[in-house]
């Protein structure tokens, strides 16, 4: 059968029939309905809503839709235990505690099963000792402490601000420095915009805020008991001690208005420059250790937290593909959420709630897309990204064959100022082109598309005329199709003016004013922003799903290659004699990259020129296209970081949500002056530079011509 | 509509104890600090108690210190004061008083007030 035969009507009209179906309206509809009680992995709540959906997307018209469930490590506050953290004076009393629980928002009153704040899976315990200031706990900023100001945390608590890098690497940072607590705040200066009210009046943090969220530093590994495997009815769990990723000391977040009680004392160094000063009105001494009055006094945090094995379900909806049954195009985003979810990571169940019913639709209308779609509802996302990674790894033998591409589906918006994408480089092309046919929801850009509105409020950094995209990290649930099994992935959502917009992520994610109608009265009233991301990212599925020819471009692959290539190259160069010294040459790699690109230009040729009408040589080409994310795969891994495998791209070891190009070389590289033994640091360099060339050559070669 | 009633008071012996109470309507105790303000015949006012509105921090005047003990129900909307080891200088109108910031740390400026209930300590 012909692509067009089997889909019944031209691609064209099946395109905008989607597209024409999706509905605002629905979308805020759905976001309701998803928010009215938490949804807390775990929980019973939880299990009903997978139910519903699950029901729903039969309804619907999806050819399957089952519940896949596991049993993964959970960590839950206690609830006749509570954390807390105290000011204690020199007999033990406390003379201040941190608050128990968040006030709840107007309407919200009577909600039960709100979990209070915690640090989800912090161990148990109650350190007492003098408080460390440490900013935003990042990897630099215990470089400043330690190297230039000479401040030991060994022994002590540390208070860091939320915000810049993913929380579980700044409570690794501390583990490092010996801290024996931490204590996480949101500062005003990151979580409080100026000039908007705060919630519930407008969608600032209040003082008495908190944002949740775990702190564990899993590397891709999924359930800490079952790494590598899923944790199904007969696996082979790991003692606790042997767990994966698990904090080692006691970890709390407070808001700000509790914060303030803990720093307005703090004496010791002052703030070593103005990057270090928040908003408060305090004066962001480091410690350690109260100011003079208040010398005797210390700090004890109260951690009584415990970890359970708890039952998760996915929901997995299936839309069989009428012409290639046998590729996987997924959509998927999770479906838990710290208390309401309202933005996460409803704003996005919802978009993929609607794209469901969309697709449904034209499926009653005799439609089925070329390639089967499969669309899943993740649990556990919050606490590290569990339900999917247990998914894949359940059917990594099925998706390493057969998938194609992922779409991520988490919160829709982060703001509404214009889109925001990351992708392989696989997917610009495809982006750029659907964005094109789009339009622009942008107050000013009225009859303008998306792509021009985007590019207008977001240029790229390096290409005039067109968006920035950025590189995937993680933190998401993309995680373990990209950095572990290859596959093409992409995410899109509305986002903030970064320019203007300072603070890190929007204000009260994780918290319990993240409602429906933070979303319904601030961000976006007439979900028009909503409905555009599910344009985007029901587009590129449809896309994805349904062109005869996968619309992957691998020359965009060959231009960012050269791009980090150069950049990695330029890094090392900021030791030259360390270089000359042992023989280090990035010749290999730049070969490999050029070699790289006058295949991809070859294949790119083939491409235009092959018999489309062939179904032999139309599945040889597509199969090489959609193999060629998988090409850049190491089955090793990284070094420390066996799940984390792509060699292009990995999440920083410093940020997980940020992505870091050769991830290999660039680890090796950093900090490499401080390293004992230079000899080794710099044969690990080469040794990393190597895997690299072998990888893009070797993927170079999967574009080749066959035979 | 918006209200804090007071309840409990009356005439007690000087060494007694005495319970009072403040039921809030109209709007959620749970949000909000309380506190407990009194005034003696002919004097001003005087702060007495505080509550954060979780519940995880109190604080009292030096003069109630350890004889007083503020407390809430947030399921009942209602907050408690209770009184023991009464003196004739704890006769005072008693009032209890919603803090104006919601999740305010420590007392801040209050801005509904209960119509108050008398407490009289005398032998």
């Known amino acids: 059968k012909s692509s067009n035969e089997a889909t019944n009507i031209t691609p064209k009209h099946n395109m905008k029939a989607f597209l024409d179906e999706l509905k605002a309206e629905n979308i805020k509809k759905f976001l309701y309905n998803f928010t009215q009680i938490p949804h807390l992995a775990g929980t019973e709540q939880n299990f009903q809503l997978a139910k519903q959906i699950q029901s729903q997307w039969k309804e619907f018209g999806l050819d399957s839709v089952e519940l896949a469930h596991y049993d993964v490590l959970l960590s839950y506050p206690n609830k006749t235990h509570p954390n807390y953290i105290s000011i204690i004076n020199e007999d033990g009393n406390e003379i201040f505690n941190t608050s128990l629980f968040e006030p709840p928002p107007p309407g919200y009153e009577n909600v039960s099963d709100i979990v209070p704040p915690f640090s989800a899976f912090s161990p148990q315990g109650m350190p007492e000792g003098d408080l460390v200031y440490v900013n935003y706990a990042r990897t630099e900023d215990f470089f400043k402490l330690e190297r230039d100001m000479k401040i030991n945390c060994s022994g002590k608590i540390v208070i860091a601000r939320y915000g810049k890098v993913f929380r579980g690497n700044k409570v690794k940072n501390a583990q490092l420095a010996g801290a024996k607590g931490v204590i996480l705040y949101s500062d005003p200066a990151d979580y409080f915009a100026p000039g908007v009210k705060s919630y519930p009046d407008g969608w600032n943090l209040p003082g008495g805020g908190v944002q949740r969220g775990n702190i564990l530093n899993l590397n891709g590994a999924g359930d800490p008991l079952t790494p590598g495997y899923p944790a199904n009815e007969y696996a082979y769990r790991r003692g606790i001690a042997e767990a994966v990723g698990l904090p080692s000391i006691p970890v709390h977040p407070i808001g700000y208005y509790d914060a303030q009680k803990l720093l307005e004392k703090m004496g010791g160094s002052a703030p070593p420059d103005s990057s270090w000063r928040g908003s408060l009105k305090v004066p962001y001494n480091v410690g350690p250790g109260f100011t003079g009055n208040f010398s005797t006094q210390k700090v004890k945090m109260h951690i009584h937290s415990t970890n359970e094995v708890t039952r998760i379900y996915n929901v997995i909806g299936t839309l069989r593909g009428a012409v290639e049954p046998d590729r996987y195009v997924i959509l998927g985003g999770h479906r838990d959420s710290w208390v309401f979810g309202g933005i996460d990571p409803q704003s996005g169940a919802a978009v993929v709630h609607e794209i469901v019913r969309s697709f449904g639709t034209l499926k009653k209308e005799g439609w089925r897309p070329r390639r089967t779609i499969l669309f899943a509802s993740w649990d556990a996302e919050e606490f590290g990204l569990l339900g999917s990674t247990e998914w894949a790894e359940e059917n990594s033998r099925l998706l390493q064959e057969r998938g194609v591409a992922y779409i991520n589906a988490d919160s829709s918006i982060e703001g509404n100022y214009t889109l925001r994408v990351d992708c392989t480089p696989l997917m610009y092309s495809l982006v750029h082109n659907l964005t094109k046919e789009l339009k622009s929801p942008d107050e000013g850009f009225e009859g303008k598309s998306l792509y021009e509105s985007w590019t207008k409020k977001s240029p790229s950094p390096e290409f005039s005329g067109m968006p920035r995209i950025s590189k995937l990290g993680s933190g998401n649930d993309f995680e373990v199709f990209f950095q572990r099994l290859g596959i093409a992935s992409g995410r899109a959502r509305y986002t903030k003016n970064w320019e203007t917009n300072k603070f890190s992520g929007y204000p009260l994610y994780h918290s319990v004013y993240e409602t429906y109608e933070l979303v319904e009265k601030f961000y976006d009233p007439m979900f028009k922003y909503h409905l555009t991301v599910a344009q985007v990212r029901g587009g590129m599925v449809f896309e994805l799903a349904n062109s005869i020819v996968l619309p992957f471009d691998c020359r965009d692959y060959a231009v960012v290659l050269r791009k980090y290539a150069d950049k990695i190259y330029s890094i090392s160069m900021k030791h030259p004699q360390e270089m000359k010294t042992y023989s280090v040459s990035f010749d290999s790699l730049f070969s490999a990259v050029k070699n790289f690109t006058e295949i991809a230009s070859k294949f790119s040729e083939r491409l235009q020129d092959f018999d489309k009408s062939n179904p032999i040589v139309l599945r040889m080409m597509n199969d090489q296209l959609m193999f060629l994310e998988r090409a850049f795969i190491d089955p090793l891994g990284l070094p420390d970081r066996p799940f984390y495998r792509h060699v292009i791209y990995a999440p920083s070891s410093h940020n997980k949500y940020a992505g870091e190009s050769f991830p290999g070389i660039y680890d090796a590289l950093f900090d490499i002056e401080s390293k004992v033994d230079p000899s080794k640091a710099w044969g690990e360099v080469k040794r990393q530079i190597y895997v690299a060339a072998f990888t893009v050559q070797a993927a170079a070669e999967t574009l080749s011509e066959v035979a | 509509q918006v209200q804090l009633v007071e309840s409990g008071g009356g005439v007690v012996q000087p060494g007694r104890s005495l319970r009072l109470s403040c039921a809030a309507s109209?709007?959620?105790?749970?949000?909000?600090?309380m506190n407990w303000v009194r005034q003696a015949p002919g004097k001003g006012l005087e702060w007495v108690a505080f509550i954060t509105y979780d519940g995880s921090n109190r604080y009292y005047a030096d003069s109630v210190k350890g004889r007083f003990t503020i407390s809430r129900d947030n399921s009942k909307n209602t907050l408690y004061l209770q009184m023991n080891s009464l003196r004739a200088e704890d006769t005072a109108v008693y009032y209890c008083?919603?803090?104006?910031?919601?999740?305010?740390?420590?007392?801040?400026?209050?801005?509904?007030w209960g119509q108050g209930t008398m407490v009289t300590v005398s032998s």
């Open positions: 008083a919603k803090d104006r910031i919601v999740g305010a740390r420590v007392p801040d400026a209050y801005d509904i």
């Open positions: 109209g709007f959620p105790l749970i949000s909000y600090g």
